[in-house]
């Protein structure tokens, strides 16, 4: 695999990373103390992640624009790939350091390598995600990430196989949003809901990232959602392969979805 | 120190409207759910809502939709619930609590009484 | 709606006995992401507001005596109280945390002989 886009393709690194997940409070953003955030991850069965934790999980693909509590009281966030809007142009741990005031809220990044993950970083040629505990409901407070990181050059096909969320007008309650980029920041294409199959998604480059996020109410069939790699198209098939893409970029933008 | 400072005991007319409140420290107000549970006398405990004052977000029990409303008041970090068209069945204590961000309320308001009488 | 039903209804004991009461949930309050059980204990007392005793089934908030213990996963959920001393007599509520509405047992009412 090798080294490209600040992201070590090495299958040894999912073990070593694995358990390494982002935590919010329930009334959003930036709501969680030291000791809450402390609270939350060992509620959970496990602890705040440790720098050399959520780097090792940032070493596979794992990037939240989030800044978040770690072990003894440090704040950070993991930055895979740079970005204007997240983490100050750098890659990395972006580190605020340990805090004197543990009554500052952040969220939480938590270690748990006995947790049933949801989510994960994913660089298989192909591979199903599917909503935690399909084919039951699925549960109500669940924030799933999907980074799908394929081979430089390759594009990502996104077909949905299964679709059932609770449905509201805006989405606001139980969704999947899709973003044709590293993070849940940038390249935004769609917030999904209801039980309408969205349309097909062909990403524009070898990353995309899904997240999925489920509110305190009511809960619905759940998903399957499937990636296959599209390996980089030869000059003699790039009219054909254009026409293509373009028909799907339509399609998905005509899904059940709302713009943030 | 969390507290929920919640207003006194109403008197009020069967079919009028009545707003309880609900002053929270502006830490609680701004970082988490504000949970209003209703007790008639005698009685057990159900939840009417949750609202989030910082995003506004309000969930309610499907059983008290059209009959409260939870609002909220930033400037001076009080979360209010509205009851409406008053009948001897809305006459209860009404708390205030405070949603952790585990699965438990952990502060409660100390409760306001509401009589309906003609 | 989760419909929490609580048994017995009440109970007298003498002080220094064990008491054993039970909640029954109509769906599993288990969240299988992460295998606790969103469910909580609350003793109220005559005036006051109820006050948390037990959350994820079996976690003692803290400061509450050891005496009190939670136990039970799914739909099946008990609070025991080793030793009961004059200061338990009060309504012991348990409640759903698993998913809204939020809905609690029509509680146990433990007076002491």
């Known amino acids: 695999w090798g080294f490209k886009d600040g992201i070590f393709h090495n299958s040894i690194w999912l073990e070593r990373a694995a358990g390494v997940y982002h935590r919010e409070a329930r009334s959003g953003k930036y709501k969680l103390t030291y000791a809450e955030a402390k609270a939350v991850c060992e509620f959970e069965g496990g602890h705040l992640a440790t720098y050399k934790q959520l780097e090792a999980a940032r070493k596979i693909g794992f990037h939240v624009c989030a800044a978040g509590w770690m072990a003894k009281g440090r704040v950070g966030y993991p930055i895979v790939k740079p970005g204007p809007n997240c983490g100050f142009g750098k890659t990395g741990i972006i580190d605020y350091g340990i805090r004197l005031n543990r009554s500052e809220r952040w969220d939480a990044y938590c270690y748990n390598p006995h947790a049933k993950e949801c989510g994960g970083v994913f660089t298989d040629p192909k591979q199903i995600f599917k909503s935690p505990g399909f084919p039951n409901e699925y549960e109500d407070n669940q924030i799933c990430y999907w980074h799908i990181r394929l081979k430089y050059g390759q594009r990502i096909h996104l077909s949905f196989l299964d679709f059932d969320l609770e449905d509201d007008p805006g989405c606001l309650a139980d969704y999947v949003e899709i973003y044709d980029s590293y993070d849940d920041v940038h390249g935004f294409v769609g917030r999904y809901c209801g039980d309408e199959l969205p349309d097909d998604i062909i990403s524009t480059g070898n990353v995309m990232t899904l997240k999925f996020l489920s509110d305190a109410s009511v809960t619905a069939g759940g998903f399957q959602i499937k990636y296959v790699a599209m390996d980089p198209v030869s000059k003699s098939s790039q009219g054909k392969n254009t026409s293509t893409t373009s028909t799907g970029n339509k399609n998905f933008l005509a899904g059940r979805f709302s713009h943030l | 120190q969390v507290q929920l400072q919640q207003s006194g005991a109403e008197l009020a007319r069967p079919g009028a409207s009545v707003k309880l409140s609900c002053k929270a420290s502006d830490d609680t107000f701004i970082n988490y759910g504000i949970n209003w549970v209703k007790q008639r006398t005698g009685q057990g405990l159900e939840w009417i809502g949750e609202?989030?004052?910082?995003?506004?977000?309000?969930f309610y029990n499907e059983k008290f939709k059209g009959k409260a409303t939870l609002t909220a008041d930033r400037s001076s970090s009080t979360t209010y619930m509205e009851l409406r068209s008053l009948t001897s069945e809305d006459a209860a204590v009404y708390f205030c609590a405070r949603h952790s961000n585990l699965p438990y309320f952990d502060h409660w308001g100390q409760g306001s009484t509401l009589t309906v009488s003609s | 709606d989760i419909v929490m039903t609580q048994s017995p209804s009440s109970l007298s004991v003498s002080a220094g006995e064990k008491v054993t009461m039970s909640c029954k949930s109509s769906q599993s309050l288990l969240n299988s992401g992460n295998q606790k059980n969103y469910l909580a204990w609350y003793q109220q007392k005559p005036g006051q507001p109820p006050k948390l005793l037990i959350y994820g089934a079996s976690t003692r908030e803290s400061g509450v005596p050891e005496r009190f213990t939670g136990s039970g996963s799914g739909t099946d959920f008990t609070l025991t109280i080793s030793s009961v001393q004059a200061e338990d007599l009060a309504v012991y509520y348990c409640?759903?945390?698993?998913?809204?509405?939020?809905?609690f047992g029509g509680g146990t009412n433990l007076e002491i002989k």
């Open positions: 609202t989030f004052p910082s995003n506004g977000n309000t």
């Open positions: 409640q759903n945390d698993h998913s809204y509405p939020f809905t």
